[in-house]
Amino acid sequence: DLLNHKKFLLLPPVNFTIKATGLAQVLLHWDPNPDQEQRHVDLEYHVKINAPQEDEYDTRKTESKCVTPLHEGFAASVRTILKSSHTTLASSWVSAELKAPPGSPGTSVTNLTCTTHTVVSSHTHLRPYQVSLRCTWLVGKDAPEDTQYFLYYRFGVLTEKCQEYSRDALNRNTACWFPRTFINSKGFEQLAVHINGSSKRAAIKPFDQLFSPLAIDQVNPPRNVTVEIESNSLYIQWEKPLSAFPDHCFNYELKIYNTKNGHIQKEKLIANKFISKIDDVSTYSIQVRAAVSSPCRMPGRWGEWSQPIYVGKERKSLVEWH
């Protein structure tokens, strides 16, 4: 039993490097120590992420990929370990780091928020739906007036640079719009967003943020809402939102507003139709919104309301399409 052998020495890995391989993504790589005796034994490695956020894990491989913001730098350590049923032997640590990029903290963007929407694909024969991305941010409080910001996103192995910006009064980019992206809003991979900047007066500190596509996906409003009045009943029907998710993946909320007395009736539904009793002297406003439900993914936020449809009073039988 090697672990009980007093003279058995575990040597640390060698050639430990940390390399940025993409936006908010690093590759840690090391080699087994060439001087390690008994190299046929089952050696493992204990990796410790020291910054920007502490984490640790064991691996049998000699490399490890980490997805994490890099604007504050990145530091990690690794050591060789040998496990048995009752004890673990460990070598000393070796460490490496990526320095934080230059720039004072107050120059980087703040309050970065991003949302995605499903849109019709430009290549419908390949896949019918794609995802649009909109991000907004605030200019850093210490950023010079001539600062210009540039946004990039990475999803999986694909990276794109923003081409369509909104600007503030000083012509600085403060929002970005991608009409179509490579993002899969059904996936579990994280979306990495990186904003760097330039100025003649100061070094602008970059900023990275990771988003869960599920968390930032904004469900479109239900389509083709139709309303019909027939003998004091309101027949309301709609189609699922524009989405890659099928019909059964949606829950709905229906809002019927009586404009005469101000009463609001709200219904949570799993069906795409509803019948409601009404009086014949009021006008009603009808809106529907959708959310992706639990059979298909973690329940998401409610999407946007459909445009209101007004029925009632003189409009005895009306069908409107939106």
Epitope: Q237, P246, C249, F274, P295
Partner: antibody, heavy 124, light 107 residues
Framework: EVQLQQSGAELGKPGTSVKLSCKVS????????IHWVNQRPGKGLEWIGR????????IYAEKFKNKATLTADTSSNTAYMQLSQLKSDDTAIYFC?????????????????WGQGASVTVSS | DIQMTQSPASLSASLGETVTIECRTS??????LAWYQQKPGKSPQLLIY???SLHTGVPSRFSGSGSGTQYSLKINSLQSEDVASYSC?????????FGSGTKLEIK
């Protein structure tokens, strides 16, 4: 209680048509979909199509597009299926089915209430 | 159309045993799967919807599981009244499609 009452057994000659009915009591069919399913002797279930009684829009499985015609009459709360150009392999039991609306539970795509089935025999 | 591959076609088990029926789909159906029980000469009855939700009034010895393209129905502690045919059905995409059915018998 929701009930789906189907018309009786039909005996049809090859090339002719039959029309089956499904009367729903205890639920307004405008608030659901009516599905039709068949089962040939000794075989499994087969989805024929569904109709949305609120607007009369049907959806058919490809193989039944020129075979079945789905309609609904909301005033009598009844759905119908006409089978045309009958052949011997149309011999089967035909079920109507629907979902009873709930605010939770299965959506209108799941069949949780069924008719008793109507036997159609095609023979010369 | 989404193809449904149900197995086994038939199975025989003893009272009190646990049995499992599998259903594989040709593409991801996002848990849009129902299981039905049909006793001889009767109409089908809904057991499970959304792959794993037990329909009202169905005994808890029935359970559904799975995701993506692989789903299963499990019957714990088999009873004599469970003799029937069992079918899976996907409602993720039109046209809806059924599995070929599994005939369950008691040994």
């Amino acid at each position: 209680e929701v009930q789906l009452q189907q018309s009786g057994a039909e005996l049809g000659k090859p090339g002719t048509s039959v029309k089956l009915s499904c009367k729903v009591s205890g639920y307004n069919i405008k608030n659901t979909y009516i599905h039709w399913v068949n089962q040939r002797p000794g075989k499994g279930l087969e989805w024929i199509g569904r109709i949305d009684p609120a607007n009369g829009n049907p959806i058919y499985a490809e193989k039944f597009k020129n075979k079945a015609t789905l309609t609904a009459d909301t005033s009598s709360n009844t759905a119908y299926m006409q089978l045309s150009q009958l052949k011997s392999d149309d011999t089967a039991i035909y079920f109507c089915a629907m979902h009873r609306g709930h605010s939770m539970g299965p959506g209108p795509y799941v069949m949780d209430a069924w008719g008793q089935g109507a036997s159609v025999t095609v023979s010369s | 159309d989404i193809q449904m591959t149900q197995s086994p076609a038939s199975l025989s088990a003893s009272l009190g045993e646990t049995v499992t029926i599998e259903c594989r789909t040709s593409e991801d159906i996002y848990n849009g799967l129902a299981w039905y029980q049909q006793k001889p000469g009767k109409s089908p009855q809904l057991l499970i919807y959304n792959a794993n939700s037990l329909h009202t009034g169905v005994p808890s010895r029935f359970s559904g599981s799975g995701s993506g393209t692989q789903y299963s129905l499990k019957i714990n502690s088999l009873q004599s009244e469970d003799v029937a045919s069992y079918s899976c059905q996907q409602y993720s995409n039109y046209p809806f499609t059924f599995g070929s059915g599994t005939k369950l018998e008691i040994k």
